[in-house]
């Protein structure tokens, strides 16, 4: 701390604001009868550099100038940028216990002229907003700086305003606080930004502009969307404005897109009719405001207007598919399955579906409503049936689609040949067929249907189904299909009145199944053996498999055992081998394969056979 | 409500100076733009000089780089500082309190809602 300059003063030539790269000469007095006791001689000024606060030289050997006693110059150079703080010390050199004693200080700050402001740019929000401009104030000084914003217009009138920059706040922005009006619309306006420090001053260079050029107008607000009789794919959208906007831009997308609709309307004066919406669909929608056809800018965009069109009628077809299953000698039940419209056909929340079963003679009609995907009857075994199924919304239904209820795998001409699948990736596989070879009659359409290979799968979960055209010989299926699952794949060929199937397993993924089979028992039946077992759980299967293998070797021996192999079939589960010798004791267990290998062994029986053995 | 009072007028030199002040009295000084406005003998009243509630201020042209106006929310007083002074600002120069809004507005006697009772300046050459 500084005791206000008692014993003397502290002066800086040229000045205490210098450019950057210049010297300065500071110049320590003490005042009369100041000093060390009663001798002047003994009298020495030192001068102390502080940066923060923080000493960092003692310019002891910079003395350009020297009154020995009462005063002396020192010349400073290489100063940095920004503030530095010089204190001039009294050492009385004949004591030397004591510290020099504070005379006075010095603050030097170093720094640059301001260049030329540039990038000047002024804007107005919305008609009744004020006016703010902004720019670039170049490098930065170092100084206290001050700009002075001014504004000329027409009735010979300036407005200013000012604001500084210094190390604590940036100047780069001015408010006027002053309003543009519309009856300004043709005037030109001049603004400048000067700029002055203890260095030198600049000006930018003037920037002309019109009320139009400036006034961004306010979003829109207020907006609202009418549908005309309740449509849905049209409507009038409204908002407010204001006054003076001639040009709008309308932007609007369903919720969940990507891609927004523009539109442009000139002198909409708050209002503009869509005709393009989906019915039944979320819509976002936003305006936007511009006062001049081809300058000025546009406003901001509005809020977001979110709403959803009104329903109407489903349009498209169901995808209906069918299962037929005979109960006795004179009756079968047919389950009727169909997909779910996809959005932009049902246009509206389908309330229900109307299903009819009739008799192509006209005999006998079944009818009924569901909210459910599927429908199950118990219809006579006699006579042609045909099904039909709509949907329904609020505002009506769509066109009913007819399937011919066929023997789905009744002709064999109509099976198709050659069917494979192939796992794809993790989550598709590729079916492939050759079309039926002798067929009566020609292939209308080939449905591939699947269905996981699980307990109860048939009566529990619906099936899969796509439909190809009949020029089409490839299906890549993927709904629902999950890796380590083994599907069973039909292709069924449709002719106008029959139908033909081929049937083989698929996965996408396979892994060795986790464990083999369970032996559950051996019996001996006519000198063979009957081995009987339990189906690996579901779950452990871990894709298709392939076979299941039977090892058998003789108890305590060393040998590689012998091996029969069988074709897996889901409804066997038990399999006769003869090559073993009676009276001896043989241990047998069994695995399963997939295509990715074969399992660990299921567990161990023991089994002396009795008889005869071949 | 609000009174305004002016002082500092009378008669000086040409390339002399004066200030010209006005002592508001009102709570609410510090919500209105300030300004001066004069009339000459014969002439019509024109608008000279504001400062905002923001602190811009506007000047016409003809005393632009002459007149500083200035205000001081606390004491409730604005003042006009007239350097370089000419014949023809020879005028009674009226403080004004108001309200206008846009840069139109400000030049327009009829948007300032007081008035003081006028100073006289007189510059002779």
């Known amino acids: 701390n500084i005791d206000v300059c008692k014993l003397g003063t502290v002066t800086v030539q040229p000045a205490p604001v210098i450019p950057l790269g210049s010297a300065a000469n500071i110049s320590c007095s003490l005042n009369p009868k100041q000093g060390c006791s009663h001798y002047p001689s003994s009298n020495e000024l030192i001068l102390l550099k502080f940066v923060n606060d923080v000493l960092v030289e003692n310019l002891h050997g910079k003395k350009v100038h020297d009154h020995t006693g009462h005063s002396s110059t020192f010349q400073v150079t290489n100063l940095s940028l920004g503030m530095t703080l010089f204190v001039c010390k009294l050492n009385c050199s004949n004591s030397q216990k004591k510290p020099p004693v504070p005379v006075c200080g010095v603050e030097i700050s170093v720094g640059v002229a301001p260049e030329p402001p540039q990038n000047i740019s002024c804007v107005q929000e919305g008609e009744n907003g004020t006016v703010a401009c902004s720019w670039n104030s170049g490098k930065v000084t170092y100084l206290k700086t001050n700009y002075t914003l001014q504004l000329s217009g027409p009735n010979n009138l300036t407005c200013q305003k000012q604001c500084f920059s210094d190390n604590r706040q940036n100047c780069n922005r001015l408010d006027l606080g002053i309003n543009l009006s519309p009856d300004l619309a043709e005037s030109r306006f001049i603004v400048r930004v000067t700029a002055i420090n203890d260095l030198g001053n600049s000006s930018s260079l003037p920037h002309t502009f019109t009320f139009l050029d400036i006034v961004i107008p306010l979003p829109p607000w207020d907006i609202r969307i009418n549908f005309l009789n309740a449509s849905g794919s049209r409507g009038t959208l409204q908002w407010e404005d204001e006054g003076q906007v001639v040009l709008n831009q309308l932007r609007y997308q369903p919720l969940n897109s990507t891609s927004w609709n523009m539109v442009n309307a000139t002198n909409a004066k708050g209002k503009y009719d869509l005709r393009d919406l989906r019915p039944f669909t979320e819509y976002e929608f936003q305006i936007s405001s511009k006062l001049h056809l081809s300058g000025g800018s546009w406003s901001n965009w509005s809020e977001s207007l979110r709403t959803r069109t009104p329903e109407e009628e489903p349009v498209g077809i169901l995808d209906i598919w069918y299962m037929k299953q005979d109960i006795d000698y004179d009756r079968q039940q047919i389950s009727l399955f169909w997909k779910s419209l996809n959005p932009s056909e049902a246009r509206g929340k389908i309330l229900h579906y109307q299903v009819t079963l009739q008799e192509v003679t006209k005999k006998t009609t079944l009818q009924n409503t569901t909210r459910h995907t599927s429908w199950t009857r118990v219809i006579p075994r006699t006579g042609a049936w045909t099904a039909s199924v709509s949907a329904a919304n609020s505002k009506g239904a769509s066109a009913p689609t007819h399937i011919n209820i066929v023997d789905l795998c009744g002709t064999g001409l109509l099976a198709p040949h050659q069917v494979s699948a192939k796992s794809e990736n993790m989550d598709n596989i590729l079916v492939t067929w050759q079309p039926p070879k002798k067929a009566d009659s020609a292939v209308r359409e080939y449905i591939v249907e699947w269905r996981a290979l699980q307990p109860g799968s048939i009566t529990k979960f619906p099936p899969h189904w796509l439909r190809i055209p009949p020029d089409n010989m490839s299906a890549l299926i993927s709904e629902n299909i999950k890796p380590y699952i083994c599907y069973e794949i039909r292709v069924h060929a449709l002719s106008e009145s029959q139908g033909g199937c081929s049937s083989i397993r698929g996965d996408s993924k396979h892994k060795a199944p986790v464990s083999g089979p369970h032996i559950t028992a051996i019996t001996e039946k006519k000198e063979r053996l009957f081995i009987s077992w339990t189906h690996i759980p579901f779950p452990e299967q871990r894709g298709c498999i392939l076979h299941y293998r039977i090892y058998w070797k003789e108890r305590d021996s060393t040998a590689q055992p012998e091996l029969c192999e069988i074709q897996y079939r889901r409804s066997q589960n038990s399999h006769p081998i003869s090559s073993l010798q009676p009276r001896v004791t043989y241990v047998l267990w069994m695995t399963a394969v997939t295509a990715a290998g074969e399992s660990p062994q299921g567990n161990e029986r023991e089994f002396c056979p009795q008889g005869k053995a071949n | 409500q609000v009174q305004l009072q002016e002082s500092g007028g009378g008669l000086v030199q040409a390339g002399g100076s004066l200030r010209l002040s006005c002592a508001a009295s009102g709570r609410t000084f510090s919500n209105y733009a300030m300004g001066w406005f004069r009339q000459a003998p014969g002439k019509e009243r024109e608008f000279v000089a504001a400062i905002n509630r923001s602190g811009t201020t506007l000047y016409v042209d003809s005393v632009k780089g002459r007149f500083t106006i200035s205000r001081d929310n606390a004491k409730n007083t604005v003042a006009l500082q007239m350097n370089s002074l000419k014949p023809e600002d020879t005028a009674v120069y009226y403080c004004?309190?108001?309200?206008?809004?846009?840069?139109?507005?400000?030049?327009?006697?009829?948007?300032?809602?007081?008035w003081g009772q006028g100073t006289q300046v007189t510059v002779s050459s």
């Open positions: 004004v309190a108001g309200m206008p809004f846009s840069y139109s507005d400000y030049p327009r006697d009829s948007k300032y809602d007081y």
